[in-house]
């Protein structure tokens, strides 16, 4: 049965050319963490492996940094990295746990955090 | 205390092969993968490829494919090297050594087994 | 393969002297970088992480410095257990890859 869940920096905006630090947190759960992957609606952005470290996708490679943690950095924003992004936990023996961010890149300079939230 | 313990030189002949035994002790040998290092002439260092005990997955340098074969025994706690179609260029020492979940670095390191390739 | 550069391949110090090895990256590798210590006919052992994160154990004359492609490793105050080489590694993305070594040697 799975038990985790993950918590998320949930709904989040951020100002055009800055950056932004996506994180998720598995809790809940004594499974293994073998890989996190990150997407962008069905665009991998990166894999972090528990053995092979982290690969980011070449054509992100330019405005994503790995870190903090198993998190993931996006610098210099647009407006067009507004939309979903998903934290997929690939874990042991439980399976996949999914987290959803969403981001709003704000022209203006009024860029709010959202609250957190979690997903089972 | 920690401990990776390898076995003994070898001196093998040109078109052998040789496995190498790395065996732990003092901590959970599934917790951690072993990775194989290649030293030639006491000068840099190669990574070779890593094993994860746990799930048996392993990955290569490109280089070392073909020429290594990575095992594990979890009953033993020991992980195993084989080297195939030896040649002097494979004369070295070999070195295996641990990492940590999403920690990509060496935190303890084997004794260490010369090779010796030589007719 | 990110390509680890090291310098200097060599240099001679005398106890009590503060030395400087430094490590060039290929490409960015942001703060994924270790430092071993070889002693002759040792095995390496772990002196820093994460470019500057010291484990357990490791004396604190040791520090790390750096992120992206230029990182150094600086001993003050030299001790005689200290002359031996050094090595830097990334640990960013396999296949992970090794400087070519500082041996630093007693002046």
């Known amino acids: 049965m799975m038990t985790g869940t993950i918590e998320t920096t949930g709904n989040i905006s951020a100002e055009k050319g800055g950056s932004i630090i996506l994180q998720c947190h598995l809790s809940s759960t004594t499974a293994q963490v073998t890989q996190v992957n990150w997407e962008q609606q069905d665009q991998l952005l990166a894999i972090c492996n528990a053995d092979l470290g982290w690969h980011i996708s070449p054509s992100f490679k330019d405005r994503v940094a790995p870190g903090p943690g198993l998190g993931l950095t996006l610098q210099s924003l647009t407006v067009n990295d507004t939309g979903e992004y998903f934290c997929i936990y690939h874990t042991y023996p439980d399976g996949t746990y999914t987290g959803r961010i969403f981001l709003e890149v704000l022209e203006s300079s009024v860029a709010e955090h959202g609250a957190r939230f979690q997903i089972p | 205390e920690f401990q990776l313990q390898q076995s003994g030189p070898e001196l093998v002949k040109p078109g052998a092969s040789v496995k190498i035994s790395c065996r732990a002790s003092g901590y959970s040998f599934t917790a951690y993968s072993i990775n194989w290092v290649q030293q030639t002439n006491g000068k840099s260092l190669e990574w070779i490829g890593v094993?994860?005990?746990?799930?048996?997955?392993?990955n290569y340098n490109q280089k070392f494919k073909g020429k290594a074969t990575l095992t594990v025994d979890q009953s033993s706690s020991a992980a195993y090297m084989q080297l195939n179609s030896l040649t002097s260029e494979d004369s070295a020492v070999y070195f295996c050594?641990?990492?940590?979940?999403?920690?990509?670095?060496?935190?303890?390191w084997g004794t260490g087994t010369t090779v010796t390739v030589s007719s | 393969d990110i390509q680890m550069t090291q310098s200097p391949a060599s240099l001679s110090a005398s106890v009590g002297e503060t030395v400087t090895i430094t490590c060039r990256a290929g490409?960015?590798?942001?703060?994924?970088l270790a430092w071993y210590q070889q002693k002759q006919g040792k095995s390496p052992q772990l002196l820093v992480y994460?470019?500057?994160t010291l484990p357990e154990g490791v004396p604190s004359r040791f520090s790390g410095s750096g992120s992206g492609t230029q990182f150094s490793l600086k001993i003050n105050s030299l001790q005689s257990e200290d002359f031996g080489s050094y090595y830097c590694?990334?640990?960013?993305?396999?296949?992970?890859?090794f400087g070519g070594g500082t041996k630093l040697e007693i002046k």
């Open positions: 590694q990334h640990h960013y993305g396999v296949p992970w890859t």
């Open positions: 994460n470019a500057k």
């Open positions: 050594a641990r990492n940590g979940n999403f920690a990509w670095y060496f935190d303890v």
């Open positions: 094993i994860n005990p746990k799930f048996g997955t392993i």
């Open positions: 490409e960015n590798i942001y703060s994924y």
